[in-house]
């Protein structure tokens, strides 16, 4: 950001701006008359001009400092934002063969695997088995499944120790989110079809869905940034 830009942005009152306070703008007749009067007037004019220049200088300096401080704060925010982006680069677009669904990229496998192997496969693709946030996301995902006789593993299985359905990110299933058909018991994992959510034995070989989060860089809007 250059200095011209700083001054262009200053909306100072017209009576204290650099242009309105220039000596050339004072009325010509103020500094005319008898020699004494002229001297006195010249002294007064000089004093007034000096005062005006001092006031103007201070005004510009203070405003410039305030503006500079504001610009520096902006720069710090932008830099912090850039640092965050650098620390964890966002995925702006879905890779080839992945389908975008809102803020996620989904990969529907074409082959079949038990749940554990499906989990491992997603890891090798720097992704995870699908995590479903709510009923709405479930429905949108199911709309992408082309036939009723296809089952896909997602990242939810039965935790025997906690006797509850547990997502692979460690959180527990909110019972309102998914209506699971089948038993909640040891070695049970969750699959989804075009129409339903099923508990299946984790050793069953079916297809699976991997997900990557889309995390676009959020540009904060600053003047001239």
């Amino acid at each position: 950001m250059d200095q011209q830009a700083i001054y262009a942005e200053l909306n100072l009152p017209t009576d204290s701006g650099p242009e309105s306070s220039s000596p050339s703008s004072l009325p010509r007749d103020v500094c005319q008359g008898s020699p004494w009067h002229q001297f006195a007037l010249k002294l007064s004019c000089a004093g007034i001009i000096l005062l005006v220049l001092v006031v103007t200088g201070l005004s510009v300096s203070v405003t410039s400092l305030i503006q500079k401080s504001s610009i520096e704060k902006c720069s710090v925010d932008i830099q912090q934002s850039r640092n965050k982006t650098t620390e964890r680069p966002g995925l702006l677009n879905c890779p080839i063969y992945w389908q975008q669904l809102r803020e996620k990229c989904l990969l529907f496998s074409h082959t079949v695997n038990p749940w554990n192997n499906s989990l491992a496969d997603c890891s090798t693709k720097e992704s995870s088995l699908l995590l479903i946030r709510d009923k709405d996301e479930l429905i949108h995902t199911q709309n992408l499944i082309r036939d009723k006789a296809i089952l896909f593993w997602i990242g939810l299985n039965f935790s025997l120790s906690e006797k509850n359905w547990k997502w692979i990110n460690g959180s527990f299933l909110n019972s309102n989110d998914l209506e699971i058909r089948g038993d909640a018991k040891e070695n049970s994992c969750i699959s989804i079809s075009q129409t339903s959510v099923y508990s299946e034995y984790c050793s069953t070989e079916i297809r699976w869905i991997c997900q990557k989060e889309l995390t676009p860089v959020r540009n904060k809007v600053y003047p001239d940034s």
Partner: antibody, heavy 119, light 107 residues
Framework: EVQLVESGGGLVQPGGSLRLSCAAS????????MSWVRQAPGKGLEWVST????????YYADSVKGRFTISRDNSRNTLYLQMNSLRAEDTAVYYC????????????WGQGTLVTVSS | DIQMTQSPSSLSASVGDRVTITCRAS??????LNWYQQRPGRAPKLLIY???SLLSGVPSRFSGSGSGTDFTLTISSLQPEDFATYYC?????????FGQGTKVEIK
């Protein structure tokens, strides 16, 4: 080695009912989808129904929907096909087969059991 | 429903012959195609899955190719035990459908 053995076939009158069974051995039965496929005398193969490993999801051919019910008992390693309102065109050899969920093929088959619907 | 059409319906060949059977789907099924062999009075047996993958234990003289709508089963050198009926089957969508079969007979 996976073995599938069907039973329950026989002669039945139109409108009657029959229950076929398929006993499985040699693999973890509950981990596999199972299906019924039939073959009318001198004809080709026709998929009838499929059930997922847990029994939670079931699928049917339109020709049998509402009349046939597929089920399984994983504790007994047994697959069933309850056939109601039987018609002459249901006459066929009924095979139980392992698989049937997309995209899997039928990798193991039973020897078949003949169902004859006739008055 | 997806219709599967095999050709020819039957063929006569001799031991050692190269035999080719084709299967055409009424719409694209990608590579979701299986081939089965059925000998008289026996249950079908899976030979090839996913259009070209040979099932373990199946002789290497059997091979499959194709994707989309057109598929081929080839027996490179026909053996006496290969005289049977061959079926293609799509597993792209339900209802799962079979071709009408191709009967391979001894010339």
């Amino acid at each position: 080695e996976v073995q599938l053995v069907e039973s329950g076939g026989g002669l039945v009158q139109p409108g009657g009912s029959l229950r076929l069974s398929c006993a499985a051995s040699g693999s973890t039965f509950s981990s596999y989808a199972m299906s019924w496929v039939r073959q009318a005398p001198g004809k080709g193969l026709e998929w009838v129904s499929t059930i997922s490993g847990s029994g939670g999801s079931t699928y049917y051919a339109d020709s049998v929907k509402g009349r046939f019910t597929i089920s399984r008992d994983n504790s007994r390693n047994t697959l069933y096909l309850q056939m109601n309102s039987l018609r002459a065109e249901d006459t066929a050899v009924y095979y139980c087969a392992r698989g049937g969920l997309i995209p899997s093929g039928f990798d193991y088959w039973g020897q078949g059991t003949l169902v004859t619907v006739s008055s | 429903d997806i219709q599967m059409t095999q050709s020819p319906s039957s063929l006569s060949a001799s031991v050692g012959d190269r035999v080719t059977i084709t299967c055409r789907a009424s719409q694209s099924i990608s590579s979701y195609l299986n081939w089965y062999q059925q000998r008289p009075g026996r249950a079908p047996k899976l030979l090839i899955y996913a259009a070209s993958s040979l099932l373990s234990g199946v002789p290497s003289r059997f091979s499959g190719s194709g994707s989309g709508t057109d598929f081929t089963l080839t027996i490179s050198s026909l053996q006496p035990e290969d005289f049977a009926t061959y079926y293609c089957q799509q597993t792209y969508s339900t209802p799962l459908t079979f071709g009408q079969g191709t009967k391979v007979e001894i010339k």
